[in-house]
């Protein structure tokens, strides 16, 4: 049986059940290389409390559809009066990066995971030439996730203080020059994740090979190498390589750009101080507030919730967007869709789409940017579920009793962007973390 998602096959992936202190290792095409789980385990559960391993999915007992992968075992589970076996179930949804498997829950018999990934899309528009896993768990099982830094087009310009060259990088995947053919990047070879531009020439100095690694609690490392043997004439016989170290800052701060810290014989070392390198719980909340020791800040957007059936309205030329954030009030146009953002076509108001649902909510404060994300909306033709990204700005003189109002700024591949100036986005900082 052919592997259902070949792009995901090259790696053993990890997911964590934080509540029960369990680490899962997942290999969807072969078996995980963990002796204690046996030779054919595709999903191996490592219970850190008891230091034991249990196979909860066998690679031989795999069944697949386009959006669901199930691994059975021969281990019976004691659900009263039934003959069930322990199994793992992975639901796949279209995403814009390779993404990460997320543990959802586990019953007596089934361990459930969800995975938003380019591999599950109906069209190839989000697929990279080369992409590697872009997250890691530290020794305390806290997730560090650089997926939000991945550029789907264009690249980051590294601060290298060399007037004659420019070094451009992407995170965990190659630079897509076709979707954003900036003049400098146009000459970059396909597949490169680190592109050195000298005058009108561009050189591949590194492609992603291995996934993100953690070297210390707040330092993550990504390595790129130039795969083909052909040496570049300015590298003194060495093969080019790029090492990017992502550093979680010791206190809350604005974002910085990646900086070149060392360069020798086409070996480039880059340091990037970014809060995305911090563990995810430091940056994100599933509610509309971020507060407490964990996050070093106090943010509460719950006063922006509208009651009594009213919504914020944002004009998007062809469409009107109705928003009701930080609550579970149905938007009337999007009745029964559980939408936090509802897109209505002006020329035909019967054409209504959920552009993100209120129970699929993430509030993120990272590198000085405050963002509220709603995902899991109605599908586009690519299979990607519509989502909305609301970027908040602090404005102590915002109208509408300080609440302000969202402004639609654009759409890219079924992701809708808004800006929102409000006094409730004014962040109160605490002490060090």
């Amino acid at each position: 049986q052919a592997a259902p998602f070949p792009e995901l096959c090259s790696y053993t992936w990890e997911a964590v059940d934080t509540k029960n202190n369990v680490l899962y290792k997942i290999n969807i095409c072969g078996s995980v290389d963990i002796v204690q789980c046996g030779p054919s385990s595709a999903v191996c559960m490592h219970d850190l409390k008891t230091r034991t391993y249990h196979s909860v999915g066998d690679s031989v007992l795999r069944s697949a559809t386009r959006s669901l992968l199930e691994f059975n075992t021969t281990v019976s589970c004691d659900q009263q009066g039934t003959n069930h076996r322990v199994q793992s179930s992975i639901a796949f949804l279209c995403g814009k990066t390779l993404g990460t498997p997320e543990f959802v829950t586990a019953t007596e018999c089934v361990h459930y995971f969800e995975w938003r990934t380019t591999a599950a899309c109906k069209k190839d528009i989000f697929k990279a030439n080369k992409e590697v896993p872009c997250y890691v768990f530290d020794e305390e099982l806290r997730k560090h996730d650089l997926n939000p830094l991945i550029k789907l087009s264009g690249a980051y310009d590294v601060d290298d203080s060399d007037p004659d060259t420019s070094l451009f990088i992407n995170v965990c995947r190659d630079i897509d020059t076709l979707r954003d053919p900036g003049s400098q990047l146009r000459a970059c070879p396909p597949g490169t994740a680190a592109c050195l531009v000298r005058g009108h020439q561009a050189f591949d100095v590194g492609q992603p090979r291995d996934g993100l690694k953690v070297v210390r609690k707040d330092r993550l490392v990504l390595s790129y190498v130039r795969e083909e043997a052909g040496k570049l004439d300015f590298c003194d016989g060495h093969s080019p390589a790029v090492t990017i170290t992502f550093v979680c800052p010791s206190e809350r701060r604005e974002g910085t750009i990646p900086k070149l810290t060392a360069k020798s014989n086409c070996r480039y070392e880059i340091e990037w101080i970014t809060e995305y390198a911090c563990h995810r719980d430091y940056l994100e909340s599933k509610t509309c507030s971020l507060s407490g020791e964990q996050q070093d800040v106090s943010i509460d957007l719950t006063p922006l919730a509208q009651s009594g059936g009213s919504s914020y309205i944002s004009d998007g030329k062809e469409y009107l967007f109705y928003l009701n954030v930080c609550g579970e009030t149905e938007i009337q146009f999007c009745n029964k869709k559980q939408a936090a953002v509802c897109q209505v076509k002006k020329s035909d108001t019967s054409q209504v789409k959920a552009a993100g649902r209120y129970h699929n909510q993430t509030l993120r404060y990272s590198d000085g940017d405050l963002t509220l994300i709603y995902f899991g909306g109605d599908e586009c033709s690519s299979g990607f579920q519509r989502m909305s990204v609301i970027n908040f700005e602090c404005n102590k003189t915002a109208g509408n009793d300080g609440k302000g109002t969202p402004v639609f700024t654009g759409e890219v591949d079924c992701t809708y962007f808004f800006t929102w100036d409000t006094e409730y986005a004014c962040v109160h900082h605490h002490h060090h973390h």
Partner: nanobody, 116 residues
């Protein structure tokens, strides 16, 4: 005050059965992962069974097919049903509760003796 109290231990013949109980107080019981451990005389404490907060269960190889862990959230109690007992199951049995927000909490233990 957070505490766990085990009961149900005693003397039983080989091949017999016992049901151990572990009553919890002072914690949101359903949020906690519950484990049973045991310590035989002169030996190290060993893990026996786990019932996670979501409901999945795992067992040590030595008790698989003979022991069953379960919980009653209404009674804040976790049980260990032990069938086909063997002399090597003789030990003090402890229950443990753990969650991301709490340090591990142990009970005081209950003695199980399997002897003819």
């Amino acid at each position: 005050d957070v505490q766990l109290v085990e009961s149900g231990g005693g003397l039983v013949q080989p091949g017999g059965s016992l049901r151990l109980s572990c009553a919890a107080s002072g914690i949101i019981f359903s949020d906690n992962r519950m484990d049973w451990y045991r310590q035989a005389p002169g030996k190290q404490r060993e893990w026996v069974a786990t019932l996670a907060s979501y409901g999945w269960k795992t067992y040590a190889d030595s008790v698989k097919g003979r022991f069953t862990i379960s919980r009653d959230n209404a009674k804040n109690t976790v049980y260990l049903q032990m069938n086909s007992l063997r002399p090597e199951d003789t030990a003090v049995y402890y229950c443990k509760a753990s969650s991301p927000v709490l340090n591990d909490i142990w009970g005081q233990g209950t003695l199980v003796t399997v002897s003819s």
